[in-house]
């Protein structure tokens, strides 16, 4: 069977939405009303990996695009990127590790930890209109907590 994928949107704990910023970057900013239609819809796939009640391995693709969030080393630093894939082969149950995030939910907080780089998380800045990035600190200035809104396919 193919991997099960569900559509969702994400907002950070400051209620910033995620939108495209150029072809290969996401940024976070506050949206209201009609502008909410700009927000990125993810296709979240439930992939193979270590799982518990609080931790579920997922891949985050952009709905109806052959782009996936992935974590790679750039200049020796774990970095978040949007990577283009062959739509004939993706998504799949056994995703390469760079595409896998541990979706961790504890006490109303939802985090996305890189499976490739433990303790590195999808992050946003406090500032408006800044890129979404992979951050190595929790509980600091940068935001690593999100809420998720599933949407009908």
């Amino acid at each position: 069977a193919p991997v099960r994928s569900l559509n969702c949107t994400l907002r950070d704990s400051q209620q910033k939405s995620l939108v495209m910023s150029g072809p290969y970057e996401l940024k976070a900013l506050h949206l209201q009303g009609q502008d909410m239609e700009q927000q990125v819809v993810f296709s979240m796939s439930f992939v193979q990996g270590e799982e518990s009640n609080d931790k579920i391995p997922v891949a985050l693709g952009l709905k109806e695009k052959n782009l996936y969030l992935s974590c790679v080393l750039k200049d020796d630093k774990p970095t978040l990127q949007l990577e283009s894939v062959d739509p004939k082969n993706y998504p799949k149950k056994k995703m390469e590790k760079r595409f896998v995030f541990n979706k961790i939910e504890i006490n109303n907080k939802l985090e996305f930890e890189s499976a490739q780089f433990p303790n590195w998380y999808i992050s946003t800045s406090q500032a408006e209109n800044m890129p979404v990035f992979l951050g190595g600190t929790k509980g600091g200035q940068d935001i690593t907590d999100f809420t998720m809104q599933f949407v009908s396919s």
Partner: antibody, heavy 119, light 107 residues
Framework: EVQLVESGGGVVQPGRSLRLSCSSS????????MSWVRQAPGKGLEWVAY????????YYPDTVKGRFTISRDNSKNTLFLQMDSLRAEDTAVYYC????????????WGQGTPVTVSS | DIQMTQSPSSLSASVGDRVTITCRAS??????LTWYQQTPGKAPKLLIY???ILADGVPSRFSGSGSGTDYTLTISSLQPEDIATYYC?????????FGQGTKLQIT
């Protein structure tokens, strides 16, 4: 014994609001995703709201999106459904159920609370 | 949305009969299918999930089968307490939807 008990149903006029509650016992509430499922008189079942175990994830079908809000208080083992701008077609028995988006099915159900929207 | 169509809508059978209820999805749901039993005036009860796995405490006379778009709930030997309406539900993609129900009566 695993149990879910709904309350808060009643008769309400169109356009008004109602808040349903669901009290749980017999299991660790904070570890489970929860949902509300409704059944109109003589009709089938419709899933109307979902919330993840910690409360960070939600889902609403288009029929209730923007009007219904699901929430939970894990310290009190209680699930809520805030229903605003009620319509005649929202008339149904509302069931609290354990389960949701990830697991996909509902393995524990409450006895239901009836909601009638009528002028 | 994936539509779930159950057949028949109602049926009558005798105690001891083998009873079959079918559920057809409007698209492939890859065994992401559940069956529920709802006795009159009560809440639904989970019978089967993932198309063929029996839920805890469900008698072994109930079984599920099928694949792709077509699924079946079978009661091998009908008992008086099985009088109920039976619903299928898929959970392949959102929204997860239910069939319209099959009302089972005893002749």
């Amino acid at each position: 014994e695993v149990q879910l008990v709904e309350s808060g149903g009643g008769v309400v006029q169109p356009g008004r609001s109602l808040r349903l509650s669901c009290s749980s016992s017999g299991f660790i509430f904070s570890r489970y995703d929860m949902s509300w499922v409704r059944q109109a008189p003589g009709k089938g079942l419709e899933w109307v709201a979902y919330i993840s175990h910690g409360g960070a994830g939600t889902y609403y079908p288009d029929t209730v999106k923007g009007r219904f809000t699901i929430s939970r208080d894990n310290s009190k083992n209680t699930l809520f459904l805030q229903m605003d701008s009620l319509r005649a077609e929202d008339t149904a028995v509302y069931y609290c159920a354990r389960g949701g988006v990830y697991k996909g099915y509902f393995d524990v159900w409450g006895q239901g609370t009836p909601v009638t929207v009528s002028s | 949305d994936i539509q779930m169509t159950q057949s028949p809508s109602s049926l009558s059978a005798s105690v001891g009969d083998r009873v079959t209820i079918t559920c057809r999805a409007s698209g492939n749901i890859y065994d992401y299918l559940t069956w529920y039993q709802q006795t009159p005036g009560k809440a639904p009860k989970l019978l089967i999930y993932n198309a063929k796995i029996l839920a805890d405490g469900v008698p072994s006379r109930f079984s599920g089968s099928g694949s792709g778009t077509d699924y079946t709930l079978t009661i091998s030997s009908l008992q008086p307490e099985d009088i109920a309406t039976y619903y299928c539900q898929h959970f392949w993609m959102l929204p997860y939807t239910f069939g319209q129900g099959t009302k089972l009566q005893i002749t």
